[in-house]
């Protein structure tokens, strides 16, 4: 790491190393021989999170609703905005700008995984023994029917889509 | 009272390394930058770098650069400086020293040190 | 970096005499600067004064310091026996610090 001129939160102006300002607040101007560092704080919906020497503040994010998004942590002078999804949908990346709709898992397909704010829904293929017969952001794999259980026995066998169906043992004479 | 108390004299081979310690005691580590600071035979003084012990950070001399490194165990209140790559130059006595409170400071560095530890001379020869 | 250069690089005064030491600074450094008294070589310094003319506490008053941009002084007052030593300005504007050469203060 290169040497600094400065200690740590200051910075170099004209040949003296001047106080940053703390998050929060923003530059009015630098210090002088005999004056310090004169800093803002921010003003409502605006946030700095660094120690800096910005002369303007950032703007809180916008949770935009039409793009689906509702605030999930509302901004301070020193921290900007979060943003999530509204109910069943999800970020389309980390910054979290836009959502879409939660996938959903196809017949034969359980959820591995439920979708989050951030994430969208894992599926995984129902295994052998499992089904699943409908398309669902929610449902897992169910196991199939257990006939002999119900004293009842396998009359068609079960696929990944569909369960087995049980039906009546034979009766010897 | 403050004392920073440097550990012993040190006899070092060219190419080789020396770690000096400096135990501070009296004040809160944390709060105080801690400088080194050396003195070769007859000669000034000739600032290596500093350690912030309260977040790691470190500042070296362009001189020392890529042969010193500055470190600090805060649950035992000391303070390190190992020099690498030993010369016969490097034969001096090193202090660390104390500067003023952190927060102190609004324009300049103001590195002023107002205690010092007691020295440590590293003599390095063949 | 900035260079500091002190003058003279030694003094021979006596006991009761007045002293000034000289450092110049090869860039402003506004009123920082600190001045060192070693007693003996391979001895920690102690910090007489900082910002340029303010005494450091415990320091007695014979010493005081003036001086802001890159011209400073050190002065003794009346040079007491104790005084005999090495004295060192050192600036604390920017990174690196830096010493100057140092005067020898000598018994005449």
């Known amino acids: 790491e290169p040497p600094t001129a400065c200690r740590e939160k200051q910075y170099l102006i004209n040949s003296q190393c001047c106080s940053l300002c703390q998050p929060g607040q923003k530059l009015v101007s630098d210090c002088t021989e005999f004056t310090e560092t004169e800093c803002l704080p921010c003003g409502e919906s605006e946030f700095l999170d660094t120690w800096n020497r910005e002369t303007h503040c950032h703007q809180h994010k916008y949770c935009d609703p039409n793009l689906g998004l509702r605030v999930q942590q509302k901004g301070t002078s020193e921290t900007d905005t979060i943003c999530t999804c509204e109910e069943g949908w999800h970020c389309t990346s980390e910054a979290c700008e836009s959502c879409v709709l939660h996938r959903s898992c196809s017949p034969g397909f359980g959820v591995k995984q439920i979708a989050t704010g951030v994430s969208d829904t894992i599926c995984e293929p129902c295994p052998v023994g499992f089904f699943s017969n409908v398309s669902s952001a929610f449902e897992k794999c169910h196991p199939w029917t257990s006939c002999e259980t119900k004293d009842l026995v396998v009359q068609q066998a079960g696929t990944n889509k569909t369960d087995v169906v049980c039906g009546p043992q034979d009766r010897l004479r | 009272q403050v004392q920073l108390v440097q550990s012993g004299a040190e006899v070092k081979k060219p190419g080789a390394s020396v770690k000096v310690s400096c135990k501070a005691s009296?004040?809160?580590?944390?709060?105080?930058?801690m400088h080194w600071v050396r003195q070769a035979p007859g000669q000034g003084l000739e600032w290596m770098g500093w350690?912030?012990?309260?977040?790691?950070?470190?500042n070296y001399a362009q001189k020392f650069q890529g042969r010193v490194t500055m470190t600090r165990d805060t649950s035992i209140s000391t303070a390190y400086m190992e020099l690498n790559r030993l010369r016969s130059d490097d034969t001096a006595v090193y202090y660390c020293?104390?500067?003023?409170?952190?927060?102190?400071?609004?324009?300049?560095?103001?590195?002023?040190?107002?205690?010092w530890g007691q020295g440590t001379l590293v003599t390095v020869s063949s | 970096d900035i260079q500091m250069t002190q003058s003279p690089s030694s003094v021979s005064a006596s006991v009761g005499d007045r002293v000034t030491i000289t450092c110049r600074a090869s860039?402003?450094?506004?009123?920082?600067l600190a001045w060192y008294q070693q007693k003996i070589p391979g001895k920690a310094p102690n910090l007489l004064i900082?910002?340029?003319?303010t005494l450091q506490s415990g320091v007695p008053s014979r010493f005081s310091g003036s001086g802001s941009g890159t011209d400073f002084t050190l002065t003794i007052s009346s040079l007491q026996p104790e005084d005999f030593a090495t004295y060192y300005c050192?600036?604390?504007?920017?990174?690196?610090?830096?010493f100057g050469g140092g005067t020898k203060v000598e018994i005449k």
């Open positions: 020293a104390r500067d003023q409170p952190l927060g102190y400071c609004t324009n300049g560095v103001c590195s002023y040190f107002d205690y």
């Open positions: 009296g004040y809160t580590f944390t709060g105080y930058y």
């Open positions: 350690i912030n012990p309260d977040s790691g950070g470190t």
């Open positions: 860039q402003g450094i506004y009123s920082w």
């Open positions: 900082y910002t340029a003319s």
């Open positions: 050192q600036q604390a504007n920017i990174f690196p610090l830096t």
